[in-house]
């Protein structure tokens, strides 16, 4: 009678992560008597995957009933496949022995390859905000994919970026891979509403790439421009001085009025108006009583924006010639106005 052969008909099997892998194996004879075992890998470090004789294998089911006397089909199914299951699987026939069974013949092996989807890309920006005209770096990471081939693109508001560097790790063979990319983006004053997008394409995604986004509103700081102006109000001895704070982002802003270098009032931006580009405008005013003043007054609007060093704009108030009333000024009637007498 011809000697038993162990046939593994599939040289390779490709399975998507989460699915079930079927590893086929048949024997050509019932003799010699003894169990079949499945291993991943060869040599002394091989891992036991299934033993017909003993052991508990919660992920493995046999395709046919191995308890049947004339069974020669030793195929197995492995459920919930992950990239860690990749490798070459050997179906090995043992001959019954005492005290231990003896390895008799091995199949040629079946290479199990696992296709695993990349994780959703995570985009992260710089730890600190930066101002327009500065270049900032964004990173994009995605993990757990297999095979290694992957494509990554960067976009800013739909426009593809070219200044980036990408690495796929590890360099050698692995059960799964990770991608890490760093892109450089030049900020503009209009970027409050902008988005940076990292797009990952992989064979497992069937042409529907994964995207990770970062809002530049988390990254950009647009410093304000200041303008201090003086207008007369109804009473002849009062002057309304306004400080226009324009085009700033984020909203966190504190304004201090100084009169001849002395702090007059400090307030925090609350009721701001938003511009189309996402930046904010705000206005603060001071009602100055200029009667009984011999000297000119230097008024300074000092703004601390988003924890940055203060910027300021000054205005010299001439007290020698009191301004005439020039009609109503709605800003002066605002309940938020503050009257300040200068002595």
């Amino acid at each position: 009678e011809e000697e038993l052969q162990v046939i593994q008909p599939d040289k390779s099997v490709l399975v998507a992560a989460g699915e079930t892998a079927t590893l086929r194996c048949t024997a050509t004879s019932l003799i010699p008597v003894g169990p079949i075992q499945w291993f991943r890998g060869a040599g002394p470090g091989r891992e036991l995957i299934y033993n017909q004789k003993e052991g508990h294998f919660p992920r493995v089911t046999t395709v046919s009933d191995l308890t049947k006397r004339n069974n020669m089909d030793f195929s197995i199914r492995i459920g919930n496949i992950t990239p860690a299951d990749a490798g070459t699987y050997y179906c090995v026939k043992f001959r019954k022995g005492s005290p231990d069974d003896v390895e008799f013949k091995s199949g040629a092996g079946t290479e199990l390859s696992v296709r695993a989807k990349p994780s959703a890309p995570v985009v992260s920006g710089p730890a600190a905000r930066a101002t327009p005209q500065h270049t900032v770096s964004f990173t994009c990471e995605s993990h757990g994919f297999s095979p290694r081939d992957i494509t990554l693109k960067w976009f800013k508001n739909g426009n593809e970026l070219s200044d980036f560097q990408t690495n796929v790790d590890p360099v050698g063979e692995s059960v799964s891979y990770s991608i890490h990319s760093t892109a450089k983006v030049v900020l503009t004053r209009e970027d409050v509403h902008s988005q940076v997008i990292c797009e990952v394409a992989h064979v497992t995604l069937q042409g529907d790439p994964l995207r990770g986004t970062a809002n530049l509103s988390e990254t950009i700081r647009v410093p304000p421009t200041l303008e201090v102006t003086q207008q007369p109000v109804r009473a002849e001895n009062q002057v309304n001085v306004t400080c226009q704070v324009r085009k700033f982002y984020p909203q966190r802003l504190q304004l201090t009025w100084l009169e001849n270098g002395n702090v007059s009032r400090t307030e925090t931006a609350s009721t701001v108006t938003e511009n189309k580009d996402g930046t904010y405008n705000w206005m603060s005013w001071l009602l100055v009583n200029v009667s009984a003043h011999r000297d000119d007054v230097k008024l300074t609007c000092q703004v601390e924006h988003d924890g940055q060093p203060a910027v300021s704009k000054s205005h010299d108030l001439k007290v020698s010639a009191h301004p005439k009333e020039q009609g109503s000024n709605t800003a002066a009637e605002n309940t938020g106005s503050n009257e300040r007498n200068i002595y």
């Epitope: 003993e54 052991g55 508990h56 919660p58 992920r59 459920g79 919930n80 005290p99």
Partner: antibody, heavy 123, light 108 residues
Framework: QVQLQESGPGLVKPSETLSLTCTFS??????????MGWIRQPPGKGLEWIAH???????YYSSALQSRVTISKDTSKTQVSLKLSSVTAADTAVYYC?????FGSGQAWFTYWGQGTLVTVSS | EIVLTQSPGTLSLSPGERATLSCSSS???????LHWYQQKPGQAPRLLIY???NLASGIPDRFSGSGSGTDFTLTISRLEPEDFAVYYC?????????FGQGTKLEIK
């Protein structure tokens, strides 16, 4: 830390169905290679494995009790239940909820045990 | 079904002595599939040794295990007062999983 807590009626009438629940914390039954099971111990006697269920929903039962036993895990994966039908006085025992871990190469053992709940079958 | 038989049923020893507990299997089993548990009165069992000879987490090294095929042994080199309990062997070689009937280790 891992905690297992059995709950259920202390007294069941003969021929009725015994229902026990094990609430666990400190791990997830969504995790690969983790299972939950039940072991019982009649008063003054030894331990008897009843059943266990793995993270992937595969169930294993004692051949002696298979026709009367059902093990299940709920969707939230923080509870495992045991139902034993047509009970008799011989089913009186302390019922332990156990965690079973699979360590590869066919090896699995009972790593954590609940404190047990005594179920008496009596009319 | 694999039947495990433990001997002796009761073992009476004094603290400081050496204890040897036996577990015999009705079928040959690989050493990786034989485990030992300890149960103190009023408590749940706890894993003591797995795979014949590996100590579970937190188990002192006065406990050791050995054996192969059908005969397995649990040894306690120097008995401490807290070691007096019931000891069970368990096989994970085949479903149904089975336990021995237990050996009660009592103070002489």
């Amino acid at each position: 830390q891992v905690q297992l807590q059995e709950s259920g009626p202390g007294l069941v009438k003969p021929s009725e169905t015994l229902s026990l629940t094990c609430t666990f914390s400190g791990f997830s039954l969504n995790t690969y290679d983790i299972g939950m099971g039940w072991i019982r111990q009649p008063p003054g006697k030894g331990l008897e494995w009843i059943a266990h269920i793995w993270w992937n929903d595969r169930e294993y039962y004692s051949s002696a009790l298979q026709s009367r036993v059902t093990i299940s895990k709920d969707t939230s994966k923080t509870q495992v239940s045991l139902k034993l039908s047509s009970v008799t006085a011989a089913d009186t025992a302390v019922y332990y909820c156990v965690r079973i871990d699979y360590f590869g190469s066919g090896q699995a053992w009972f790593t954590y045990w609940g404190q047990g709940t005594l179920v008496t079958v009596s009319s | 079904e694999i039947v495990l038989t433990q001997s002796p049923g009761t073992l009476s020893l004094s603290p400081g002595e050496r204890a040897t507990l036996s577990c015999s299997s009705s079928s040959t089993i690989s050493s990786t599939y034989l485990h030992w548990y300890q149960q103190k009165p009023g408590q749940a069992p706890r894993l003591l040794i797995y795979g014949t000879s590996n100590l579970a987490s937190g188990i002192p090294d006065r406990f050791s295990g050995s054996g192969s095929g059908t005969d397995f042994t649990l040894t306690i080199s120097r008995l401490e007062p807290e070691d007096f309990a019931v000891y069970y062997c368990q096989q994970g070689s085949r479903i149904p999983f089975t336990f021995g009937q237990g050996t009660k280790l009592e103070i002489k």
